[in-house]
Amino acid sequence: APTSSSTKKTQLQLEHLLLDLQMILNGINNYKNPKLTRMLTFKFYMPKKATELKHLQCLEEELKPLEEVLNLAQSKNFHLRPRDLISNINVIVLELKGSETTFMCEYADETATIVEFLNRWITFCQSIISTLT
């Protein structure tokens, strides 16, 4: 059966989110600088469960800390200024989860590094895309 236009739109939004998150991850992994060590000391909250679009609330709540860590890097590896990058991500997250969502995010007990955090949300996006295909 042909994929509905709303599903296609969701897929494209998830692809865009993936692109932004992978750009950040690449930028961090390419960052041959002592600042990388400091970036890895920052801790991020991870979702207890992330299987549905509403769980993007957990990502949204961590965008400000993410921006702060990226500002620390002051790197050209991110292709865009951190503020613009996070703004892009925020817009997409709001569109995907819906701005009316009143979902209360539950976090895991263990915190994570920025690399683990990004990997978790990239995995989430890829997983949702796969279920929609």
Epitope: L18, L25, N29
Partner: nanobody, 118 residues
Framework: QVQLQESGGGLVQTGGSLRLSCTTS????????MGWYRQAPGEQRELVAV???????NYADSVKGRFTISRDNTKDTMYLQMNSLKPEDTAVYYC????????????WGQGTQVTVSS
């Protein structure tokens, strides 16, 4: 090291056509998802078109029916055929290729300028 190189950009009049190419050097597996995004000065980056390893395509509403994405895995090349161009399509166009499994490597080109004059 994998590198992507865009070509085919330029100046065109409203209603005209351009075909962008994205050639990869190094190994880009046919299973990678590839796509095109564009960035206009002062604007948010816009994902224009995507093509999966299996050939499934997806387009932004703003280009649907006018742009066509395709790939030729035998030539390690991806294309974006742009028809009925509008001034609002003016931007730098970047191609990218991303792994769909960990470690989630992402590659993108330097971009090619597309200018549509009215």
């Amino acid at each position: 090291q994998v590198q992507l190189q865009e070509s085919g950009g330029g100046l065109v009049q409203t209603g005209g056509s351009l075909r962008l190419s994205c050639t990869t050097s190094g190994t880009i597996f046919s299973g990678y998802t590839m796509g095109w995004y564009r960035q206009a000065p002062g604007e948010q980056r816009e994902l224009v078109a995507v093509i999966s390893g299996g050939g499934d395509t997806n387009y932004a509403d703003s280009v649907k029916g006018r742009f066509t994405i395709s790939r030729d895995n035998t030539k390690d090349t991806m294309y974006l055929q742009m028809n009925s161009l509008k001034p609002e399509d003016t931007a730098v166009y970047y191609c990218y290729s991303r792994e769909v499994t960990p470690p989630w490597k992402l590659y993108w080109g330097q971009g090619t300028q597309v200018t549509v004059s009215s």
